[in-house]
Amino acid sequence: CDLPQTHSLGSRRTLMLLAQMRRISLFSCLKDRHDFGFPQEEFGNQFQKAETIPVLHEMIQQIFNLFSTKDSSAAWDETLLDKFYTELYQQLNDLEACVIQGVGVTETPLMKEDSILAVRKYFQRITLYLKEKKYSPCAWEVVRAEIMRSFSLSTNLQESLRSKE
């Protein structure tokens, strides 16, 4: 399955939107910095494309879930947030189309269980952090920066997969 060129453009647009969503300086939130333990090894280049697609899908789905909450709606600009949802939704569709085409359907669910679990637990930590910080502006800024970093890392994986072909 070839992810359309528009998919990587969408990834770049998603990162741009995340950058534009910034409301306060991260430097004013240094005391709120947190290591969320992004499971980078689960996005390593050793996987075949068929194996990475469900993990990338999970990553984007979890980002969508995180920013779809009412607490998130209160924290960010509504117009930017709507554009952000649209980009994520399109990327989910692209990845789902690949799965439907039968890429790795037989082995994927079991093979990638651990990677998908690692991603879900990463977002559990982010969700709990926000709750502990009472969804403060600084907490959301820390999370926005973290999602930019982790999304960028997973996007780099997509690009490396494209270039390998």
Epitope: D35, G37, L110, M111, E113, D114, L117, K121, Q124, E132
Partner: antibody, heavy 123, light 108 residues
């Protein structure tokens, strides 16, 4: 309530290997990881590693990488821990314990434990 | 790796006393901490998970608190059955974990 039943005590020579089994009384492998923990005489609890019985994936603290092997036979509902190159410092009671793979309540505690297997390493 | 440091290493208290055991993590682990009671010749028993949630059938005299790096296990009124060694365990990057060194509780 599910039970984890471990194999019996072992006496081994230094340099040898030991394999301990941990059988679940009912299927718990789809929803739980199996962990191994040991307690040496007069010491505290030490975590040895985790196993996802359905995928075979494992994880270990640095100290035990390469010397502890964790495997399972899902058809037998049994997990195994093998420790190689045994020394007297490996004399301990070894426990298996389960933990949820994913918990909405953040419950990542070891809620069910085996009864323990005593391993003595002596020349 | 994340380390957890427990204190005190041992304590002696009378029946009815309030007992407090502390655990400090080497980094912010939110509330990913569990507490166990371990008696000689038995398997450890999970008392509290997620820093403050009492496991099923654990007496209400046990309670846990804390968040970030500092955590506390409290026994409000020590009972004869409460002797043993208590351990904290961090599960921030579950399924990886680590245990504290333990606190031995003796009855005076």
């Amino acid at each position: 309530q599910v039970q984890l039943i471990q194999s019996g005590p072992e006496v081994k020579r230094p340099g040898a290997s030991v394999k301990v089994s941990c059988k679940a009384s009912e299927n718990t492998f789809d929803t739980h990881y199996i962990n191994w923990v040991r307690q040496a005489p007069g010491q505290g609890l030490t975590w040895l590693g985790w196993l996802n019985p359905t995928t075979g994936k494992t994880g270990f603290p640095q100290k035990f990488k390469g010397r502890v092997i964790l495997t399972s036979d899902t058809s037998l509902n049994t997990a195994y821990m093998e420790v190689s190159r045994l020394t007297s410092e490996d004399t301990a009671v070894y426990f298996c314990a389960r933990v949820l793979k994913l918990s909405d309540e953040y419950n990542y505690g070891f809620d069910v434990w085996g009864q323990g297997t005593t391993v003595i390493v002596s020349s | 790796d994340i380390q957890v440091t427990q204190s005190p290493s041992s304590l002696s208290a009378s029946i009815g006393d309030r007992v407090t055991i502390t655990c400090r993590a080497s980094q912010n682990i939110l509330t990913f901490i569990n507490w166990y009671q371990h008696k000689p010749g038995k398997a450890p028993k999970l008392l509290i998970y997620a820093a403050s949630v009492l496991q099923n059938e654990v007496p209400s005299r046990f309670s846990g608190s804390g968040s970030g790096t500092d955590f506390t296990l409290t026994i409000t009124s020590l009972q004869p059955d409460d002797f043993g060694t208590y351990y904290c365990q961090q599960t921030y990057l579950t399924p990886q974990c680590s245990f504290g060194q333990g606190t031995k509780v003796e009855i005076k």
